[in-house]
């Protein structure tokens, strides 16, 4: 008789999760000389220790502290790019602009990007069938708590001018419930961060509206200003041209507004 197993509303752990985490760690530490000292087996042990045998609705930031210790990494604090609901373009940008970093360009972000994981209370099993959904089941699940923890630390590390890429095609360009809106915005340190500069990415080719005037952007400006951080906003009307101009800034067409 098969043992009863909790059915959650979200997808189960990504197949070959342990192997994927270990392989990504090895790859990352090979590419980034400053992280060569990292012992990837210990990284996996720490990752595993954070959620294995724990109820997947009762995970805390404390559970991830050993992993956070092992993944401690110094990125230039004035070269941080945050993003919300526009991950692919943000990653394309930092692949070209190599001196800027998204969270997923750090070891811990790279390890977990696009993966799902959870365990079961009091067993050593990884649950490949289902994991808790943030809305339908619980917010203190292994994946959500991980991203909350690393996002908080990433925002806390930022300084000078911090950039954020926002999706202008969404009904809420700035969403208070996103990781950016609920975690990162509130963990920028006013004593270190001078300005938050939002880049609003337009979707339609003929969209010439000033999305920096959007009510949700005004809401973001208000939140940031109350935290004694300056706010600025730019429209990126042509994301394709924007990326092209990052690659080839000398191109004559790159002097006009993009």
């Amino acid at each position: 008789v098969p043992r009863w197993r909790q059915q959650w509303s979200g997808p189960g752990t990504t197949k070959r999760f342990p192997e994927t985490v270990l392989a990504r760690c090895v790859k990352y530490t090979e590419i980034h000389p400053e992280m060569r000292h990292v012992d990837c087996q210990s990284v996996w042990d720490a990752f595993k220790g954070a959620f294995i045998s724990k109820h997947p609705c009762n995970i805390t930031e404390e559970d991830y502290q050993p992993l956070m210790k092992l993944g401690t990494q110094t990125v230039p604090c004035n070269k941080i790019l945050l993003w919300s609901r526009i991950k692919d373009l943000a990653h394309q940008f930092t692949q070209v602009q190599r001196d800027m970093f998204t969270l997923e360009d750090t070891l811990l972000g790279y390890l977990a990007d696009d993966l799902t994981w959870c365990g079961e209370f009091n067993t050593s099993k990884i649950n490949y069938q289902s994991c808790p959904d943030w809305r339908k089941d619980c917010s203190n699940n292994p994946v959500s708590v991980f991203w909350k923890t690393v996002s908080r630390r990433f925002a806390e590390a930022a300084c000078d001018v911090v950039h954020v890429m926002l999706n202008g095609s969404r009904s809420k360009i700035f969403d208070k419930n996103s990781t950016f809106g609920s975690v990162e915005v509130h963990n920028l340190q006013p004593e270190k961060v001078q300005t938050l500069e939002a880049w609003v990415i337009h979707g339609g080719r003929e969209d010439s509206r000033d999305l920096c005037q959007d009510p949700t952007i005004k809401e973001l400006e208000s939140i940031i200003s109350k935290r004694n951080i300056q706010f600025s906003c730019k429209n990126i009307y042509r994301p394709d041209k924007f990326l092209q101009c990052v690659k080839n800034p000398e191109d004559s067409s790159c002097t006009s507004e993009i």
Epitope: H37, D45, K48, G49, K69, S124
Partner: antibody, heavy 116, light 107 residues
Framework: QVPLHQSGPELIKPGASLKISCKAS????????MNWVRQRPGKGLEWIGW????????KYNGKFMGKATLTADKSSGTAYMQLSSLTSEDSAVYFC?????????WGQGTSVTVSS | DIVMTQFHNFMSTSVGDRVNINCKAS??????VAWYQQKPGQSPKLLIY???TRHTGVPDRFTGSGSGTDFTLTISNVQSEDLADYFC?????????FGSGTKLEIK
């Protein structure tokens, strides 16, 4: 193999304090949990606590609070354990050992004899 | 504190035999258990962690099994160099605790 080299044997008087060192020979020192373990003659192993040199975080076995103090020097890759108010009960071999999910590398041990 | 009980202080075996060394935790530690070998006059050596993962360089005749509260270290095809004390340890809860040890004697 990651050798951990501990300071030599100590003969110490009751009531005195003592500092034992444990030097790591690899660059992973800052990113390892450094444990200290006691083994009294003919007895088992007792975990004293650990230090994580990367951020100087420590965790102690309540039994050794006030008795042992763990510190680390990142620049030299050395962990230290200070033992205070020593009594004959503290006579033992003290090991440093690296690791958090099982202690994968151990020092050779430091023998401490407390006697007047 | 979690108590790790090794019921046999001594076990006697012959070269080539298979021996099981047992360890019982006073509460569920899932698989957060390590096994160590300590030869006379030496430091302990890690054999097994996560209850069943063999540490680098450990011969495959050493096998760990169990979960929850009951754990076993199995040595198959015992060799004369296996004469040692064997300790289990839990790292599920603080403080970490060790079993009292099982001395393996070779007949």
């Amino acid at each position: 193999q990651v050798p951990l080299h501990q300071s030599g044997p100590e003969l110490i008087k009751p009531g005195a304090s003592l500092k034992i060192s444990c030097k790591a020979s690899d660059s992973a020192f800052n990113n390892s949990w450094m444990n200290w373990v006691r083994q009294r003659p003919g007895k088992g192993l007792e975990w004293i606590g650990w230090i994580y040199p990367g951020d100087d975080d420590t965790k102690y076995n309540g039994k050794f609070m006030g008795k042992a103090t763990l510190t680390a020097d990142k620049s030299s890759g050395t962990a230290y354990m200070q033992l205070s108010s020593l009594t004959s009960e503290d006579s033992a071999v003290y090991f440093c050992a690296r690791g958090r999910w099982g202690m994968d590398y151990w020092g050779q041990g430091t023998s401490v004899t407390v006697s007047s | 504190d979690i108590v790790m009980t090794q019921f046999h202080n001594f076990m006697s075996t012959s070269v080539g035999d298979r021996v099981n060394i047992n360890c019982k935790a006073s509460q569920n530690v899932v698989t957060a258990v390590a096994w160590y070998q300590q030869k006379p006059g030496q430091s302990p050596k890690l054999l097994i962690y996560w209850a069943s993962t063999r540490h680098t360089g450990v011969p495959d005749r050493f096998t760990g099994s169990g979960s929850g509260t009951d754990f076993t270290l199995t040595i198959s095809n015992v060799q004369s160099e296996d004469l040692a004390d064997y300790f289990c340890q839990q790292y599920s809860n603080y403080p970490f605790t060790f079993g009292s040890g099982t001395k393996l004697e070779i007949k």
